[in-house]
């Protein structure tokens, strides 16, 4: 079965090939402590963030 | 050499509950996903759902939602998966599966056969 | 839900004869990251399944290569150049592209 949780991402090479996999459809990220998960929502918006983080780490030609 | 070896057969009362497992051995736990798997004549095969050990994390077939709850157990290499108030419905043989990326190797545990009847 | 179509339910082949098995899904499996996520497994008697083929047509080690998968976006076979006696058993195409994950029905490879 592909995994849902630890899907490989493929490295940033440039923003234009750059795609974002996350984990699909209705995902409990509750953990052994009983923590209650983050929403899909908020999964999607730190992944983002992330993205854009690493996008401006790129060096662009002059 | 990758293993997971499930529990034995289960003959439960319907409304009871019962915790099948799932030991693997042969590879770090916690490095790989387990998927488990329902098997019926009138259903065929269906996807229960995932746990992730390292982070507790589970996604569930909307469909065994309030039915299956996935556990793992990292100091023994384990997976659970809980089913409750049972009925004939739930009768079935129940597979592990390890994760993969959608391409390397493919294991399977051998199976649980649970009969739920009174 | 994805519906994956299995034809035929039954098959029944001779020795040395090529077989050839149907799946179908109700949406396209190309996913976003490019591959289709569509499988092949066998399950022989008694036994647990067996995964055969990934990504539509690349077999699993051990795996004869009289075994070929083919196929994209919802029209998908499996076929058996020479059909052996340890073939026999049921197969199921299965897709992990889309939540949640799914089955084909199966098709029982019987020899005649």
């Known amino acids: 079965m592909r995994n849902i949780f630890k899907r490989n991402q493929e490295p940033i090479v440039a923003p234009a090939t750059t795609t974002a996999t996350m984990p699909i459809g209705p995902v409990d990220n509750s953990t052994e402590s009983g923590g209650a998960g983050e929403s899909q929502e908020d999964m999607f918006a730190k992944l983002k963030e992330k993205l854009f983080n690493e996008i401006n780490k790129i060096p662009l030609p002059p | 050499e990758v293993q997971l070896q499930e529990s034995g057969a289960e003959l439960v009362r319907p409304g009871a509950s019962v915790k099948l497992s799932c030991k693997a051995s042969g590879y770090t736990f916690t490095d790989y996903e387990m998927h488990w798997v329902k098997q019926t004549p009138v259903h065929g095969l269906e996807w229960i759902g995932a746990i992730d050990p390292e982070t507790g994390g589970t996604a569930y077939n909307q469909k065994f939602k309030g039915k299956a709850t996935l556990t793992a157990d990292k100091s023994s290499s384990t997976a659970y998966m809980e089913l409750r108030s049972l009925t004939s419905e739930d009768s079935a043989v129940y597979y592990c599966?390890?994760?993969?990326?959608?391409?390397?190797?493919?294991?399977w545990g051998q199976g649980t056969t649970l009969t739920v009847s009174s | 839900d994805v519906l994956m179509t299995q034809t035929p339910l039954t098959l029944s082949v001779t020795i040395g004869q090529p077989a050839s098995i149907s799946c179908k899904s109700s949406?396209?499996?190309?996913?976003?990251?490019?591959?289709?996520?569509l499988n092949w497994l066998l399950q022989r008697p008694g036994q647990s399944p067996k995964r055969l083929i990934y990504l539509v047509s690349k077999l699993d080690s051990g795996v004869p290569d009289r075994f070929t998968g083919s196929g994209s976006g919802t029209d998908f076979t499996l076929k058996i150049s020479r059909v052996e006696a340890e073939d026999l058993g049921v197969y199921y195409c299965w897709q992990d592209t889309h939540f949640p994950y799914t089955f084909g029905g199966g098709t029982k490879l019987e020899i005649k």
């Open positions: 599966t390890r994760g993969n990326d959608g391409y390397n190797e493919d294991y």
């Open positions: 949406q396209s499996l190309l996913d976003s990251d490019g591959k289709t996520y």
